[in-house]
Interface confidence: medium
């Protein structure tokens, strides 16, 4: 059956994918389309109740910090 990711395993996988950037359980506001759906889709909906791959997990990483110029 489809593989799902829940609880502590979900957090562990997010830490693997996102590193110290951190992550959100809901996509950051303004992610992708500017039109927000209601209710907001979260990672538990996408990866625990359904299956998702590592690229999908990456969508829940915190945004990259802007590069500081030397």
């Amino acid at each position: 059956g489809p593989e799902t990711l829940c609880g502590a395993e979900l957090v562990d996988a997010l830490q693997f994918v996102c590193g110290p950037r951190g992550f959100y359980f809901n996509k950051p506001t303004g992610y992708g389309s500017s039109i927000r759906r209601a209710p907001q889709t979260g990672i538990v909906d996408e990866c625990c109740f359904r299956s998702c791959d590592l690229r999908r997990l990456e969508m829940y990483c915190a945004p990259l910090k802007p590069t500081k110029s030397a």
């Epitope: 829940c6 693997f16 110290p20 590069t67």
Partner: antibody, heavy 115, light 105 residues
């Protein structure tokens, strides 16, 4: 001490299958996610697949998605990689690596795909 | 996707200091943890530096890591012949292309 020992490599024809194993000891096996990483002859390292510590979640590199399957048996402290539809470009040494930092590696097992 | 670029080779004489760079393209690696691996000839990779600058137990303090902006660096001081190896940086599941360190003489 932590020990990871791979086995199951060998020579296989294109389109064939192999199953690699990685036997683990010296740590609490069920507390760590595991990965397979490969290295083609004379080339660099390429991450292949990831499995969460309970085994309920897996992830794959695009190059192997749909052909390889990672699994684990937490009662036997063993990690597996089932490789189907093998191609010449899958020829490599395959390593199992522990955790998300790849802090321990096995010695590797060579897979050669050739006719 | 993250791409990590390393110089193909570096060299130095025994006792010298060498550095190996790891540069991220299209993503700011300053937001990630960078890990470094050493692969001696004919052996499996070994974790050398994790989380940018931390050394696992057993790794000599001649090895150090740092990170700034879009690049990370591995420094080796007091170069020894046994340091001759391939060195790889990584971010999560992405590896750099590797750098071959040659110890001269």
């Amino acid at each position: 001490q932590v020990e990871l020992v791979e086995s199951g490599g060998g020579l296989v024809q294109p389109g064939g299958s192999l199953r690699l194993s990685c036997a683990a000891s010296g740590f609490t096996w069920s507390s760590f996610a595991m990965s397979w990483v490969r290295q083609a002859p004379g080339k660099g390292l390429e991450w292949v697949s990831y499995i969460s510590y309970l085994g309920s979640y897996t992830g794959y590199a695009d190059s192997v998605k749909g052909r390889f399957t990672i699994s684990r048996d937490n009662s036997k402290n063993t990690l597996y990689l089932q490789m189907n539809s093998l191609r010449a470009e899958d020829t490599a040494v395959y390593y199992c690596a522990r955790g998300t930092k790849f802090d321990y590696w096995g010695q590797g097992t060579l897979v050669t795909v050739s006719s | 996707d993250i791409v990590l670029t390393q110089p193909p080779s570096v060299s130095g004489a025994p006792g010298q200091r060498v550095t190996i760079s790891c540069t991220g393209s299209s993503s700011n690696i300053g937001t990630y943890d960078v890990h470094w691996y050493q692969q001696l000839p004919g052996t499996a990779p070994k974790l050398l530096i994790y989380s940018n600058s931390k050394r696992p137990s057993g790794v000599p303090d001649r090895f150090s890591g740092s990170k700034s902006g879009t690049s990370a660096s591995l420094a080796i001081t007091g170069l020894q012949s046994e340091d001759e190896a391939d060195y790889y940086c990584s971010i999560t599941r992405v590896f750099g292309g590797g750098t071959k360190l040659t110890v001269l003489g």
